[in-house]
Each structure stands twice: as C-alpha cells, then as structure tokens.
C-alpha cells in the first residue's frame, strides 16, 4: 500500500537498518526509497526537547510485515518509502537549506557569488554530493562567499548542525542538470586499476554499470565476466573511484569489461531498471518466498509486486509437474544484489522491475527549442501526437500527449460522434501532416476512456485517455511528457507553450507544420472575470495574452499546454475551450492536469 504522507510526532519502533543524516523528513523519505531494503523511516527534526546530536537523524527501517509499531515522540517524523508506490520517483533535490551545515569531507573550497553558483559547481564536479556555502553575512570575514564542496561514502552528510548565515544543498546531478561528460561506452578486455570502494555481484557489465551509477561514490567500474579465469572473482563488479575522477591505469585483460558511472547520462539512460532475464543463471540471496509460477516473466511480476523482493530465480517445471508451473524464488540481500551468481543449474534469474519507476523516461532532455517563430522543429515536442479519424475520410481530429508507453492523454470533447476506437489512428513523431501517408505506421486505439463526469468542455472534466493497441518505443522523436506532481500545485509556471496543428484563425484549416506559441498562464480569478457566463473551476487552468493574438484554436484540442519547470517539461494543461481564438481578454481554457493525476493513475494502472 502506498502511503505518501508523513506522520508527525510519530516514531517507528525497531526494524533499524542504518542511520543517516538528512536535512528534512522529505529527503529522508527519498533516501529510504533509494535504499535497497528500507521500507519505513523515522526522522528527528530540530527541537528544543531533543538532544541536538539527534537532530536531522534519519533512521532507515525494514519490516517483514511492511509496518512497525508507532510510538508518540515529539519532533519525530515518520513515513514510508515510495517503493510501495507506483508513481515515478526522483532523487532530484533542489532545496536549499538555510542555516544548516551539512558535514562531509570538504575536498574543495572556492569563492562563489551565490549559493546557486556553488550548487552549480557541485553539480559539475564529479566527486561532489552536497555543498555548504557561507553567505556574505557570515561572521568570519575570510570564510564569506566560500563554497565548500563535500562528499561522503553514503552520499548523505555524516552530520548536520545548525550554523547561522550558511546554506547547504545537494548536487543536482540526479536532476539531469550536470554538464559533466556522459561516457556510455563499455570497454572490453579492460581493467581499471584504481581503488575499489565497494564490490557487488552482477550478471553482466550493464547491470554493473547501472549499480555504479546509483552508488554515491562510484565513478567507474570493472566487471569480471563469467569466463574470467579466477573462479572466485567471476561476476564480480568492482566499484571504483580516483582523485582525478578518471581511471589512472587501464590494464588489458581478457574477459574483463570496464566503464564509467552514467550519473551524467541519467536523464537518457535507465540506471535502476535491470529488465533482462539471465538464462541458466541462479542468483543467491536471502529467500523471501517460494511461489509457483508459469514462466520466468510471471516470476518477475511476482517479484516486482512483492515490495521486499529485489531479485529472483525461476526454475522451470519438470515435465507434467505441478500443472506445468515452475518454482519462483523471491530473494533479497543487504545491498540489492545477489550474494553469489551461479551458472549451469538451469535457473532463469532477473531483478524486480519496481525500481524502473526511478528512471523517468519523461525527464529526458530534448532538443533545445528554436526561439521565436511559430513553426516547430522535429523532435521539439516529442510527446505531441496527432489523432486522426478515418471517418468520413482520414484527417487530423485532435492533438494528444504521450504520457506512457501505451497511453495518450487528450480531451474528452474530441470524441463526440466517435462510435468506436477502431476508427482512430494515433501518429507520433510527426512534424508535418503531409508526412502521413497511407503506409505511415500508426498506433491503433484499443480503448477510449472518457472521464465519467464529462458533459461538455465548458463544464470541465474535459479529459480522456486513449489506450493504444501496441506500445510506443521511446525515441528522440516520440517520448512521454511528465505529469505534474500533486506537490507542485503551487508552482508558478513561467515557460508554457501550446502546440498543435489547429487553425491559425477562426475560419481557417488544419496547419501542415506543428505550430507552437509561448503563452503566459492567467490566474483563475482573472480568467473568471473574462468568462462571466461560465464557471472557471480549479480543475481548469487558463492561458493567454490580455491583448490576444496567440492562442490555441480549432484542431489544437486535446493537445498539450507544456510547461518547463526545473528543466523538465510537464503536461500542465489539455487544450479544451475558449471564446473564439486569440481574442482580446479571452484566454484559452485548459483542463488542469494536476487535478486529474489520481484519475489518470487509477485508469492507467487498472490493468
């Protein structure tokens, strides 16, 4: 069960795995989520009633029952890991903590103009996990404007203390904001001879590389394959670092592979999701459960659905045994990796897919936009789709947005008179309508899910989901856009764009090239003044220029109002309705997507 809210003045008793320091309960929850075993946590906030040495402690906990007894304790904040949740998770933390000194190894000290500059420096430094910046009000003159870059073994502070006139924060590498080089290559027959900070077992070099990526201290790795001569080192993944950040020595050795942390590629490469199956391979670890399963795929599903399961081994059924079901061994370990990997026993092994949600496809950086001009360029809005009807003839009907590999979010009013999903075709990766020919591949629509409270666009609930017949393979030209987070309701979006092939004036025709317009959001109070005959609800969001001139129009319906926030594009609105197009003091009205996130998740995960 997914529990996102924090429990104030509550402590979970027992189940301790380890204690780390975090500047907030919110970040403690993130640390717990990313820890291989943590399911619950208790954070101690600063409080006069608490011993200052316990302030900011984040105790990570585990429990076989997935819960622990609760005890009342002032200043304690407890909660659950997001492992139990199905929504996307990110380790990105842009918060700046005022008057907190986050302790670690201070390995670099330099002058910076601002905390932001210090944070950027940390983000672009290969070793940096977090920083502390002494502001210009700091009492000690020689320390003013000093930016201390820090790292620790765990990536979290070794202690956090109160210190006036300093601010602290984390590297934004996990926000995909680092300018560090992204080296994706894996080098065969190569050993990096640098100090090992840790070692784990891995079935292949790719998994080893992904483990290195989310290990806080790992900068590069060496993996010994199963053909490595020394038996005790087979499948060993050595996580490495060096002072320079690069391997000091490369040794040519057969059956070894080496590579780099993908920390700077995280926006474009999955680093948590190990989705492959390993045949004739057994993963050893602590046994969680043994369940009958029809196939290794079914076994992986069972592991994914069991929150404590980290990996599994499936042994296929012996002929006519147990109704053709094999045994599915659900397993875990202290670090999330098998304790040993054996070959030649006939098992099929793999990992939970639960961690895949930590790799958010929608955060992928896309092409830089062309500023000015109204025509888009290829790949500029890769989530935008054109929804065609084939009735009476094939034509663009509405826009839509890719939000998942089988899901398009669009407007309910697009489906007036559409009797069957079969007559619809979804085209993705399209810039010009003229590209769409008879033999252009498309996605058939399996189901149209219209919000059951929808009556007409002007009354709200103008939202619909299209379930596609086949899945979308993400590429640079077709990929999802992030849904806004419910926690971002108060975010003021300043970089919003409406896109579509719709009319450019009220009496016009569908445009050939995808058009774009940057449009400012308008408060609901302001919008209500412009539409006195309508009720502008909190489930709607408005955008437009007071003087008019830029707006969505007929044919843009269902398409996205995309807003860039923290370098990530969010689907803030769905083009819904308006009085005319681009009229003075008549903003466009959009479905406020954040208000429907629960509905979207309920429908898309109801499988």
């Amino acid at each position: 069960e997914c529990v996102t809210q924090l429990l104030k003045d509550t402590c979970f008793e027992g189940g301790d795995i380890t204690t780390v320091f975090t500047p907030s309960a919110k970040y403690c929850q993130v640390v717990c989520t990313y820890h291989p075993r943590c399911l619950l946590f208790t954070f101690t906030a600063e409080s006069p009633s608490e011993d200052p040495t316990r302030w900011f402690t984040c105790v990570l906990k585990d429990s076989v029952t997935e819960t622990l007894p609760r005890v009342n304790r002032t200043a304690a904040i407890s909660g659950y890991s997001f492992k139990q949740c199905s929504h996307q998770i990110s380790a990105c933390n842009k918060d700046i903590y005022v008057d907190l000194d986050m302790k670690g190894i201070n390995y670099n000290s330099s002058v910076a103009k601002s905390a932001q500059e210090c944070q950027e420096r940390c983000t672009d430094d290969v070793h940096c996990h977090f920083f502390t910046y002494a502001t210009r009000q700091f009492p000690s003159l020689e320390h003013r404007n000093i930016c201390l870059l820090k790292h620790t073994q765990t990536g979290t502070p070794t202690r956090i203390t109160k210190l006036d006139k300093v601010v602290s924060g984390f590297s934004l590498k996990s926000c995909a904001l680092s300018n560090l080089a992204c080296i994706r290559d894996i080098f065969p027959n190569t050993v990096f001879a640098d100090s090992n900070i840790d070692s784990v077992m891995a079935p292949d070099a790719f998994v080893c590389g992904r483990i290195c990526t989310h290990h806080p201290g790992c900068l590069f790795f060496t993996f010994f394959s199963q053909e490595w001569p020394k038996e005790s080192q087979r499948n060993l993944c050595l996580l490495k670092t060096s002072e320079s950040g690069l391997p000091s020595t490369r040794i040519k050795k057969s059956k070894a592979l080496s590579g780099f942390s993908l920390q700077s590629c995280r926006h474009s490469i999955p680093v948590f999701c190990h989705s492959s199956f390993y045949h004739d391979t057994d993963f050893l670890g602590e046994e969680l459960d043994i369940v009958a399963a029809k196939s290794h795929e079914a076994c992986q599903k069972l592991c994914t659905n069991a929150v404590r399961c980290q990996f599994f081994t499936y042994t296929p059924a012996q002929a006519s045994c147990n109704e053709g079901k094999g045994k599915c061994y659900l397993k875990l370990s202290s670090n999330g990796s098998p304790t040993k990997i054996l070959h030649g026993r006939g098992g099929i092994s793999g990992y939970t897919l639960r961690l895949c949600k930590m790799d958010n496809e929608c955060t992928t950086k896309i092409k830089p936009r062309i500023v000015g001009g109204t025509a888009s360029v290829r790949g500029e809005w890769p989530w935008q789709v054109t929804l065609h009807t084939t009735s009476p003839t094939q034509r663009h009907l509405c826009g839509g947005s890719i939000i998942g590999n089988q899901w398009i979010l669009t407007a309910a009013h697009c489906f007036y008179g559409v009797e069957s999903p079969k007559i619809l075709r979804v085209y993705s990766g399209i810039l010009n309508q003229s590209e769409i020919k008879e033999d252009t591949s498309f996605f058939g629509v399996q189901e149209i899910i219209i919000h059951d409270q929808y009556k007409m666009a002007e009354s709200g609930y103008d939202i619909a989901l299209l379930k596609l017949e086949t899945t979308v393979n993400y590429t640079d030209s077709q990929r999802p856009i992030c849904l806004p987070s419910k926690g971002d309701r108060n975010v003021i979006y300043t970089d919003c764009w409406v896109t579509g092939w719709g009319y450019r004036k009220l009496r016009d025709k569908i445009q050939n090239t995808l058009q774009k317009a940057k449009i400012p959001l308008v408060t609901n109070e302001e919008c209500q003044k412009r539409y006195r005959g309508h009720k502008i609800t909190h489930k709607m969001i408005c955008a437009g220029y007071r003087e008019g001139g830029k707006d969505a129009c007929k044919g843009d319906s269902g398409g996205p109002l995309s807003c860039k926030h923290n370098e990530v594009w969010h689907l803030v609105g769905i083009t819904s309705w308006g009085e005319g197009c681009a009229q003075r003091e008549r903003p466009g009205v959009y479905t406020n997507v954040v208000e429907y996130v629960d509905w979207i998740l309920e429908k898309t995960q109801a499988v």
Partner: antibody
C-alpha cells in the same frame, strides 16, 4: 493489387429485397471504410452509407436509413448491402467503393439492379 | 446536408482546349473535395483528392484547385480520351454528397 469484385445483376419485383456483395482483396479489409454509392441511369452519384469492417460502425444517408443495411464478413473480406422494400426508384447501378487514405480510391465494377413487375 | 452544385451540366470542347468544371459547396468543406472521371459503362475513377492533389497515375493535364466552398477541375489540354462524365464529391461531413455531374464531349 486492390480489387473490389461485386455480385452479378439482379432483377427483382417491387416489395422484394436484394442483397449485394462486394469481395475485397489486395489490402487489409478491416482497416478501411467501405462505402456504397447508387447511380440511377443517366444520373449523378448518390451516397447510401458506409461500414468499418473492424468495428461494424456504420453511417447512412437519412433517405436509405430504414431500408439499407450494411454488413461485413471479415473472414471472407466481403461487404454486403441489403436493400428492402424495393420500388422502381431503386433501379440503378450500385457501387461499392473503398475510402482510401485520401478519397474513394477503388471502386467495384458495379451491380445493376432492376426492379420491375 | 451539404449540397454540391456542379456546373456546367454538359460541355463540348475541342481537342487541345483548356476545360474548366466548377463545383460549389453550400457550406465550407475546407479541402475535402474529390473529382472523379466516369467513362460510359465503367465505374468512376479517382482523379483529384483533397481539392488539388492528383491521384497516382492521373495525367498532369488534370489539376484541381479551391478551398472552402469553391472548387475547380481543369483539363489544360483536352484529349479525345477525356470524353466522360465528371463528378465532384465532398467527404467533409456526413452524409457524403456529390455534384450532379458534368458530361464532357468533343466538338
């Protein structure tokens, strides 16, 4: 290549019914609308209706709604039009035509229906 | 229903002449207009779709133009084999409708 082959000529008495067939080949039958068009002798073209074989969705001209029934058999890639309560006004050539990506791009050879007592 | 008014209903022209047939829609049909050629005893054949796009294999002497409510089919240099009936049709909305046809003859 795409082909639409229609059934042969029909001679019917007033009040009777007729069922015309149109066998499609050379393309995915379920993915295209099939339309039926009437052409009385020396007259223009008149749209009757259409069917989407994959979902059996249909549309009819109001004039034919009560008497025409369009069906499709996806197993044989054949579209049918059943026309009931025939009168002399129904004497005409009836065409099936595929609505391609752009327009009615392929037409059957036509079936002549004569209604006479 | 959208009414498609085609004119003239018949016309006679000489080989090599430029021939124009017009079709007027009773309301905006954007560019969802097709032109068909029908020779005696044959089924119609698609010439022009989307008001101005020549269908595969159609000689380039045939061209279409127009949008909204007014549409034109032009034969730039009439050939003997162009003797036929010509029909315009709209596929913008149901019910689909056709013009009454134009009979084209050689003088």
């Amino acid at each position: 290549q795409v082909q639409l082959v229609q059934s042969g000529s029909e001679l019917k008495k007033p009040g009777a019914s007729v069922k015309l067939s149109c066998k499609a080949s050379g393309y995915t039958f379920t993915r295209y609308w099939m339309h039926w068009v009437k052409q009385a002798h020396g007259q223009g073209l008149e749209w009757i209706g259409n069917i989407y074989p994959d979902s059996d969705s249909t549309n009819y001209d109001e004039k034919f709604r009560t008497r025409a029934t369009l069906t499709a058999d996806t197993s044989t890639s054949t579209a049918y039009m059943h026309l009931s309560s025939l009168t002399s006004e129904d004497s005409a050539v009836y065409y099936c035509t595929r609505m391609g990506f752009y327009a009615m791009d392929y037409w059957g050879q036509g079936t002549s229906v004569t209604v006479s007592s | 229903d959208i009414v498609m008014t085609q004119s003239p209903s018949s016309l006679s022209a000489s080989v090599g002449d430029r021939v124009t047939i017009t079709c007027k829609a009773s309301e905006n049909v954007v560019t969802y207009v097709s032109w068909f050629q029908q020779k005696p005893g044959q089924a119609p054949k698609l010439l022009i779709y989307g008001a101005s796009n020549r269908y595969t294999g159609v000689p380039d002497r045939f061209s279409g133009s127009g949008s909204g409510t007014d549409f034109t089919l032009t034969i730039s240099s009439l050939q003997a084999e162009d003797v036929a009936d010509y029909h315009c049709g709209q596929s913008y909305s149901y019910p689909l409708t056709f013009g009454q046809g134009t009979k084209l003859e050689i003088k």
